[in-house]
């Protein structure tokens, strides 16, 4: 009897949907996996024989709840399946934002880019899949814990009145209000202040 | 919620032409990819044209230089001209929307579209 994969999971970020599993403990020899959809009552091969332990599933409708399934096979044998249930615009993990920030004297001037659609075309990003698309920022002065959070109205946000000649941190996250679901952080991003009317070149 | 209609189907000889149409509604995206899906009975529901919100198409093997796949956006209407039809094109049509999609490298299966019409019969007969 061939064992099922194992750990079988969907590791989505942004739409770009791969199923991932384990290798199941096997004496016999080396297992091959397919994983397939389900389409309209009938199952469809995505991945036939692979050696791998994923397989890509990004071109689901990012709309529809897709039921996906993966086998370990060996010679002619075959485990069960093992199914799991997707749907992406409700399951996918919204990816950190870009941020671009400059400093202007005592603020802060800052600008959000939305993740880009895994997949689809470069000026497609999460923001036109959501609606209800916004941003979350947090701030803090380096090297303290208190954390400021804001939430910008527009792809743009500036912090002003900031303390001079001090380095702030500045991170940004996709939210979606309608679903209350929030997306991963962005990496911090570290400027310190001057206290002069300098133009940021 | 976003709405398709078709129609044009009906009855027809082989080597006629029909005129399926698609209308939409209920938009809330500004940008679709769109296709054209049959079902003959007892069989899978498979892929016949798409075409991306830049207007690029494609076509299943079996109806490449018969068929004709386009849209009008100011109507939100999608086509498909039917050409040289023979029997086997005998099927329930479907239309199907997905937003934020490119047709390019997708494989025309249903499951990649989110949105369906209820269909519209055609019939060819020898």
């Known amino acids: 009897m061939v064992p099922p994969p194992e750990n079988v999971r969907m590791n989505s970020v942004n739409f770009k949907n791969i199923l991932q599993w384990e290798s199941p403990a096997f004496a016999k020899g080396n297992l091959t996996f397919t994983a397939q959809y389900l389409s309209y009552r009938i199952f469809q091969d995505k991945c036939m024989n692979t050696t791998l332990t994923e397989c890509d599933f990004s071109s689901l409708s990012k709309y529809g709840d897709h039921t996906l399934r993966v086998r370990a096979e060996f010679a002619d044998e075959h485990s069960d399946w093992v199914n799991i249930t997707f749907c992406p615009v409700d399951d996918t993990i919204i990816g950190p934002p870009g941020m671009q920030v400059e400093v202007l004297a005592d603020s802060l001037h800052m600008r959000f880019l939305a993740p880009k659609i895994e997949n689809e075309y470069e000026t497609w990003t999460m923001k036109n899949v959501y609606n209800s698309w916004t941003y979350n920022v947090q701030y803090w002065k380096n090297g303290t814990d208190e954390k400021f959070q804001i939430t910008p109205q527009y792809d743009f946000e500036v912090l002003r009145n900031l303390e001079p000649w001090t380095t702030y941190c500045v991170q940004v996250r996709g939210f979606l209000p309608d679903r209350n679901k929030a997306g991963e952080w962005s990496e911090p991003v570290c400027e310190q202040t001057t206290h002069d009317e300098t133009v940021p070149s | 919620q976003v709405q398709l209609q078709e129609s044009g189907g009906g009855s027809v000889q082989a080597g006629g032409s029909l005129r399926l149409s698609c209308a939409a509604s209920?938009?809330?995206?500004?940008?679709?990819?769109m296709g054209w899906f049959r079902q003959a009975p007892g069989k899978e529901r498979e892929g016949v044209a798409a075409?991306?919100?830049?207007?690029?198409?494609s076509y299943a093997d079996s109806v490449k230089g018969r068929f004709t796949i386009s849209k009008d956006n100011a109507k939100n209407t999608l086509y498909l001209q039917m050409n040289s039809l023979k029997p086997e094109d005998t099927a329930m049509y479907y239309c199907?929307?997905?937003?934020?999609?490119?047709?390019?490298?997708?494989?025309?299966?249903?499951?990649?579209?989110?949105?369906w019409g209820q269909g519209t019969q055609v019939t060819v007969s020898s």
């Open positions: 199907a929307a997905e937003p934020w999609c490119t047709s390019q490298g997708r494989g025309r299966e249903s499951a990649e579209f989110g949105y």
């Open positions: 209920g938009y809330t995206y500004s940008s679709y990819c």
């Open positions: 075409i991306d919100s830049d207007g690029s198409t």
